[in-house]
Each structure stands twice: as structure tokens, then as C-alpha cells.
Amino acid sequence: FNISGCSTKKLLWTYSTRSEEEFVLFCDLPEPQKSHFCHRNRLSPKQVPEHLPFMGSNDLSDVQWYQQPSNGDPLEDIRKSYPHIIQDKCTLHFLTPGVNNSGSYICRPKMIKSPYDVACCVKMILEVKPQTNASCEYSASHKQDLLLGSTGSISCPSLSCQSDAQSPAVTWYKNGKLLSVERSNRIVVDEVYDYHQGTYVCDYTQSDTVSSWTVRAVVQVRTIVGDTKLKPDILDPVEDTLEVELGKPLTISCKARFGFERVFNPVIKWYIKDSDLEWEVSVPEAKSIKSTLKDEIIERNIILEKVTQRDLRRKFVCFVQNSIGNTTQSVQLKEKRG
């Protein structure tokens, strides 16, 4: 189809080479006053909707995205050619950064109901550049945490080194919906609830003498509980003695619950005490067996190929530790009678 009639938008994605980061394009189809065909069943040209990307009409809940090859070849369907780009309704998600994402992206409704609708399309010219500005060492991350129940803020990564006074007007979106009251480079949250988590997008306009473009950054915000104030607890073994059969293989499992910590360095290990001697045992790797918002359960097993008489004189000790403290649980083996 002829894309010469598409409205055009220029965007800049400056990505940090230090961190994983994502990017999104919204299918910002023209507002009714620009092209009433895009929303013709919803609003008269006089009615101006709240400007939400892709929210103007049910007809637009499904759009087609294309990329325009730089060599002038025909438009390519995004879904067929680009596995690192995912389409979610009217949003295009770029899962990995890189200058190879630069290019022209076109979106239009799948359902073209009249000849006029052909012009109902948007061409987005995306320029992708690695961040070179070293002067801003502490720019905000593209992954930000909010502590549940406390005050917090979400900073626009591309503007976080500027003071509020210097900052241009910013347009914020949360999960694709416009946050119309937010205009500064930082969103302040008075009290954090779990619904504050999501994908936030901040846009601001930059221009030179020739043209203007939108600088966009994407922030993944998660809500977290406060760091635990408790040392880990051992859920298994509970008993300090274990009945065993001599000559048989044995696996003793240690399962420990660690409270949430933002910097999580759990320790779980087995050691053996034999009279005055004590040594750590080489055992299989620890593995997570459950994770929830508030805690994680980690398991580590000690495996004896066969239980010997000597093992009955030893104590097998599971040791667990986090930044708060440590806990141990010892197990003495006892021969099963009868």
C-alpha cells in the first residue's frame, strides 16, 4: 500500500550499553480532527478524545506493523522477520537494544473498511543510538523498584540528570495508557501499592533548527516488599535424628526459607562434624524450589552412596545464611532396628 499519506513521527532511543533495556512503539493513529476516518464510528470531528495511543476505537485494537527496508524493497511484516520484536495489540515491543533496530516502522488498522482508510496509518522513524554521555554517571535505571507501603518515585532515565526546573515537559504512559496529569521528569507516588507496577514510558520533545523528534525511554517498574529483617529459617529437616539402614544410599534434604532482599546472596551448605573435626561437604548445587513476593525457598541435598557405621557417629549440619544472620540444623543418623 502507498505510505506517502501516512502521518510521520520521529523517535530517538538512546540505550545504555550497561543494562538490559526494552523499547516500545505505540500505533499513534491520527486523532479525529486530523483524520476522522480512523475513529469515524466513535467521535464526531468536533469531539476531541483523551489522547491515548491505540485506544480511540475498537476497530484499532488490531493493527498491522511493517518495517520499511532502507534499500527500498517492499514493506516487511514485522511478525515474520523480527523475532526480537513482539506485537501486543497496538504496541510494538523491542526486547533487545541495538542500532540495528533503527529504521522506519509503519502501522495501520488490519480492517480497511473504505478507500479513505488507506491514509489511516503512521510512519515512525526510529533512530537508535548507544548512550555516549558519560557526564551523567548516575542516570536512572530502566528497571526501578518501588517499596510497597512507602513513598516512592519513578524517574525518566533520559532526563534523570536534569533538575526539575530544567526539565522539558514530559508525557508519561503506564501500560500504554496516557497519564495525563504527569508532566515532569519524575512521577512521585505518595503511597506505593502493587498496582503501581508496570511498564512506564516517558516521552519528551527535542528539536534543532531543521526538525523535532520524540525522545523516548521505557521503565519497568516493580513493587517490592521491604528487605527482610529476619535470618533464614530451616523448614526441613525438622527432626534432629533420622532413622537409616546401614549399607543403603541416603539423601538428606535441607530446605530453607529466605525473606526477600533486594541484594540476594543466600548461603546454604552442608558440613559434617566428627568429634573435634568439622568439614564442608561437596554436595549438588542448591536450587530454588519456590519463590513468592516475600520469600524464596532453597533446597540443597547431601547424598551418601551408602550409610556406614562411621556415619552414625557423625552429625550432619545444614547451615543457612543471609545478610541478617545464620541458622543451623543438625541431624544425627540412627540405625533402624528390626
Partner: antibody, heavy 116, light 111 residues
Framework: SVEESGGRLVTPGTPLTLTCTAS????????MGWVRQAPGKGLEWIGI?????TTYYATWANGRFTISKTSTTVDLKIIRPTTEDTATYFC??????????????WGQGTLVTVSS | AAVLTQTPSPVSAAVGGTVSISCQSS????????LAWFQQKPGQPPKLLIY???TLASGVPSRFKGSGSGTQFTLTISGVQCDDAATYYC???????????FGGGTEVVVK
């Protein structure tokens, strides 16, 4: 909302990937589970991708399925489908503080039929 | 793996009456309370009713009540309505998520 896609008729042994797409929330902040239901039968727990990003599979499902997550989708791959894998596959969001059974948001399901 | 055994199906209830469904686990659930109840109607996905053994999910009428701890749990529907005709499933979470399971389901028929 969550929406499953990718269900279709496949022949036994042909790998199949189902996709769960989230709208209105970020998958990074939630556990996401997969559950299936054979025609006329009960619900069967397949596995869950926990909030830490680690995936946990039901004992019977280990080695038969893989679950992987991005910020917008959760995929369930049926590695070597058999006729017993014919079912509607549901994706669901987990919201519990200390639980992974609190599945509050479910998709409509996608039907997988395995037949030669 | 854990096994959850539910009251055999179907269970009949009169409109306005009370119905109880039991769910027994072969091992203790995590924290003694990691048990949820779901309602499913034909052609629809399951709907969360109760989590944490006794906490009512958002938007669920107060006539649904969950109780129990450890290995034995009950879902009670009082003042049964026609709309409550459905299959009900319990779901248990355990120390190891690999043991998580659903019960076999109990069909409630409203007369």
C-alpha cells in the same frame, strides 16, 4: 487481561509453542502459571514462572514442557506432544505474597488437539 | 507429588440451602494455609474464590467461605443461588512448587 494463543491441531511428536500475552500489567512483577484441562476432565497444574524468574514444573510435567517469560509474553512449549496432551491450556497470573496458588486472572484458554 | 482429594461429584443443593465441599491433601500445604478454591462454569476459565484457605478474593460474594488448615479444608456456600451451579476445584501449594496440584473437582447441582 491475559490471552493465550497458538493452540491448533498437531501430529504426535511435533513440538508446539503456546503464547500468553499480558495487557495492562507487566509480567516482570508477577508469577505466571500454566494449567490445562482435557475435554470433560479436571484442571491439571503444569508449572509456574515465579516472581524471581525461576520456573517450577509439576513433577509429571518436568521434561515434557518448558516455560519461558519476557516482559510481555509467557511461552509454554510442549516438547513432544502425545494424544494425552489434547486439552485446553490456560495461562493465569499469580498475585500472592507468600503463595503461588492465588491465580486471580485467567485467559479464556487455547485448545490443543494432538492427533495423527 | 501431593494429591488433593475432593468430595465426590455431584453434590446437590437446594436454592437458599447450604453446601459444603471438602478437600484433603496428602501432605501439609505451605504455611498450613496455601490452599485456594476456584469455581468453573462450562466453557469458561476458572475463577478464584478463596485464597490462603479462608480469604475471599476480590468481588466474590460473602456467602462463600473457606476454612481449614494443614491437610483438611472445606468450602461452604450458604444461601445457595442458581448461579452457584458449577464445578469447584481446590488447589494446594507446597514447600516445593513442583508438588502443587488441583483436586479432582466437585460439581455442585442446584435444585
Amino acid at each position: 487481561s491475559v490471552e493465550e494463543s497458538g493452540g491448533r491441531l498437531v501430529t504426535p511428536g511435533t513440538p508446539l509453542t503456546l503464547t500468553c500475552t499480558a495487557s495492562g500489567f507487566s509480567l516482570n512483577s508477577y508469577a505466571m502459571g500454566w494449567v490445562r484441562q482435557a475435554p470433560g476432565k479436571g484442571l491439571e497444574w503444569i508449572g509456574i514462572n515465579g516472581v524471581s524468574g525461576t520456573t517450577y514444573y509439576a513433577t509429571w510435567a518436568n521434561g515434557r514442557f518448558t516455560i519461558s517469560k519476557t516482559s510481555t509474553t509467557v511461552d509454554l512449549k510442549i516438547i513432544r506432544p502425545t494424544t494425552e496432551d489434547t486439552a485446553t491450556y490456560f495461562c493465569a497470573r499469580g498475585v500472592g505474597d507468600t503463595t503461588d496458588t492465588q491465580l486471580d486472572l485467567w485467559g479464556q484458554g487455547t485448545l490443543v488437539t494432538v492427533s495423527s | 507429588a501431593a494429591v488433593l482429594t475432593q468430595t465426590p461429584s455431584p453434590v446437590s443443593a437446594a436454592v437458599g440451602g447450604t453446601v459444603s465441599i471438602s478437600c484433603q491433601s496428602s501432605q501439609s500445604v505451605y504455611n498450613d494455609n496455601d490452599l485456594a478454591w476456584f469455581q468453573q462454569k462450562p466453557g469458561q476459565p476458572p475463577k478464584l474464590l478463596i485464597y490462603g484457605a479462608s480469604t475471599l478474593a476480590s468481588g466474590v460474594p460473602s456467602r462463600f467461605k473457606g476454612s481449614g488448615s494443614g491437610t483438611q479444608f472445606t468450602l461452604t456456600i450458604s444461601g445457595v443461588q442458581c448461579d452457584d451451579a458449577a464445578t469447584y476445584y481446590c488447589s494446594g501449594g507446597y514447600i516445593s512448587s513442583s508438588d502443587n496440584a488441583f483436586g479432582g473437582g466437585t460439581e455442585v447441582v442446584v435444585k
